[in-house]
C-alpha cells in the first residue's frame, strides 16, 4: 500500500518535500515515477539511478529517500502530484498528493 499526506501546503518562493511511503511484505520497489498532473517530474530506478525531467531540473532535487524536493515554488505549482511505485513482483501502486502554494 501507499501512504502519503493527501494535502500539503507551502509558501510561494519556498520549497516542499513530496513523499510517498510504500509498504509490502512481498514486493520490492524497482522504480518510482513522480508526475505533476500528466507531466513527468522525475524517475528513480533502483538500478539506473535518478532522472529529472529537463524542464524541472533547476527546481527539482531528488530525495530525501524516494521523494522529491520541489524548490522555488510558484502559484502555478498548485495542483495534483502523483507517485507511481513499480514493484517486483506485485505490480504498480499509485499515490496522490495535492499541493497548495500560498502567497508569501
Amino acid at each position: 500500500t501507499i501512504d502519503t499526506k493527501r494535502n500539503i501546503s507551502a509558501e510561494e518562493g519556498g520549497s516542499v518535500i513530496l513523499q510517498c511511503h510504500f509498504s509490502s511484505d512481498t514486493a520490492e520497489v524497482t522504480q518510482v515515477d513522480w508526475k505533476q498532473q500528466d507531466q513527468l517530474l522525475a524517475i528513480y530506478s533502483v538500478d539506473l539511478g535518478w532522472h529529472v525531467a529537463s524542464v524541472f531540473s533547476d527546481r527539482v532535487v531528488p530525495g530525501p529517500s524516494l521523494g522529491l524536493t520541489f524548490q522555488s515554488l510558484t502559484m502555478n505549482d498548485t495542483g495534483e502530484y502523483f507517485c507511481t511505485y513499480h514493484t517486483y513482483p506485485g505490480g504498480i501502486y499509485k499515490g496522490r498528493i495535492f499541493l497548495k502554494v500560498q502567497e508569501s
Partner: antibody, heavy 125, light 107 residues
Framework: QLQLQESGPGLVKPSETLSLTCTVS??????????WAWIRQPPGKGLEWIGS???????YYNPSLKSRVTISVDTSKNQFSLKLSSVTATDTAVYYC?????????????????WGQGTMVTVSS | EIVMTQSPATLSVSPGERATLSCRAS??????LAWYQQKPGQAPRLLIY???TRATGIPARFSGSGSGTEFTLTISSLQSEDFAVYYC?????????FGGGTKVEIK
C-alpha cells in the same frame, strides 16, 4: 560503444541445463548502470523476454520461466550469463543478450538499446 | 502482465508508400514504449523509445506516436531496406513484454 557477444553450446539435450554467456566489450560491466538482459526467439516466432539483472544485483524474470531461470554477472570476466534448467524442445530458439537503459539518464526511458548477434540453441536428443 | 497486441500481422506496401503499424497495450504504459526492426538472420534494432524518440542513427522517415494504450509507428516513405518485421515492447513495469510483430512486405 558497448558490444555484446553470446557464446555457449548450440545443442542441448532434453532435461539438461542450457548455459549461455554474454561477453561485454567496449566498457566495464561493473561501472555501467544498465539492465543486462536475455531475450529469445523460437524459429519463425516473435521475441520473448527471459529476464534481466540490474546493477543492484536484483534479478527480474519472465513469470512463465521463473522457476527454471538464473541470470548472473561475473564482473571479473566482464560477462553475464543465463542458465535455463530442464529444457525441452520448446526452448529451441535464437538467444540474444541485450543492454537496457542506455538512454535513461537523459530521457527517463528504458529500451533494449544494444543487442548481441544472437546464438541458436537447439534442444534435441 | 501487460499484453501487447500488434496489427496487422502482415502489411503489404509498395516502395515509396507510407506504412502505419499499430500497437495496443492491455493497460496504460504511459509513454514507455519502444519499437524495433528485425531483418532475417539479424538481431532486432531499436528504432524508437519513449513512444516517439528516434534512437541514434535512425532515419527521420521513422516516427512514433501515441501514449497510454494506443501507439503507432509510421514509415513515411518505404525504402527497400525497410521491409522487415517490427515489434513493439513496453517497459516498465516487469515483466517486459513484446508484441507479436508486424511483417512489412513488398506489395
Amino acid at each position: 560503444q558497448l558490444q555484446l557477444q553470446e557464446s555457449g553450446p548450440g545443442l542441448v539435450k532434453p532435461s539438461e541445463t542450457l548455459s549461455l554467456t554474454c561477453t561485454v566489450s567496449g566498457g566495464s560491466i561493473s561501472s555501467s548502470r544498465y539492465y543486462w538482459a536475455w531475450i529469445r526467439q523460437p524459429p519463425g516466432k516473435g521475441l520473448e523476454w527471459i529476464g534481466s539483472i540490474g546493477t543492484s544485483g536484483s534479478t527480474y524474470y519472465n513469470p512463465s520461466l521463473k522457476s527454471r531461470v538464473t541470470i548472473s554477472v561475473d564482473t571479473s570476466k566482464n560477462q553475464f550469463s543465463l542458465k535455463l534448467s530442464s529444457v525441452t524442445a520448446t526452448d529451441t530458439a535464437v538467444y540474444y543478450c541485450a543492454i537496457e537503459g542506455a538512454n535513461f539518464r537523459d530521457f527517463g526511458y528504458v529500451a533494449f538499446d544494444i543487442w548481441g548477434q544472437g546464438t541458436m540453441v537447439t534442444v534435441s536428443s | 502482465e501487460i499484453v501487447m497486441t500488434q496489427s496487422p500481422a502482415t502489411l503489404s506496401v509498395s516502395p515509396g508508400e507510407r506504412a502505419t503499424l499499430s500497437c495496443r497495450a492491455s493497460q496504460s504504459v504511459s509513454s514507455n514504449l519502444a519499437w524495433y526492426q528485425q531483418k532475417p538472420g539479424q538481431a532486432p534494432r531499436l528504432l524508437i523509445y519513449g513512444a516517439s524518440t528516434r534512437a541514434t542513427g535512425i532515419p527521420a522517415r521513422f516516427s512514433g506516436s501515441g501514449s497510454g494504450t494506443e501507439f503507432t509507428l509510421t514509415i513515411s516513405s518505404l525504402q527497400s531496406e525497410d521491409f522487415a518485421v517490427y515489434y513493439c515492447q513496453q517497459s516498465p513495469p516487469w515483466p517486459r513484454t513484446f508484441g507479436g510483430g508486424t511483417k512489412v512486405e513488398i506489395k
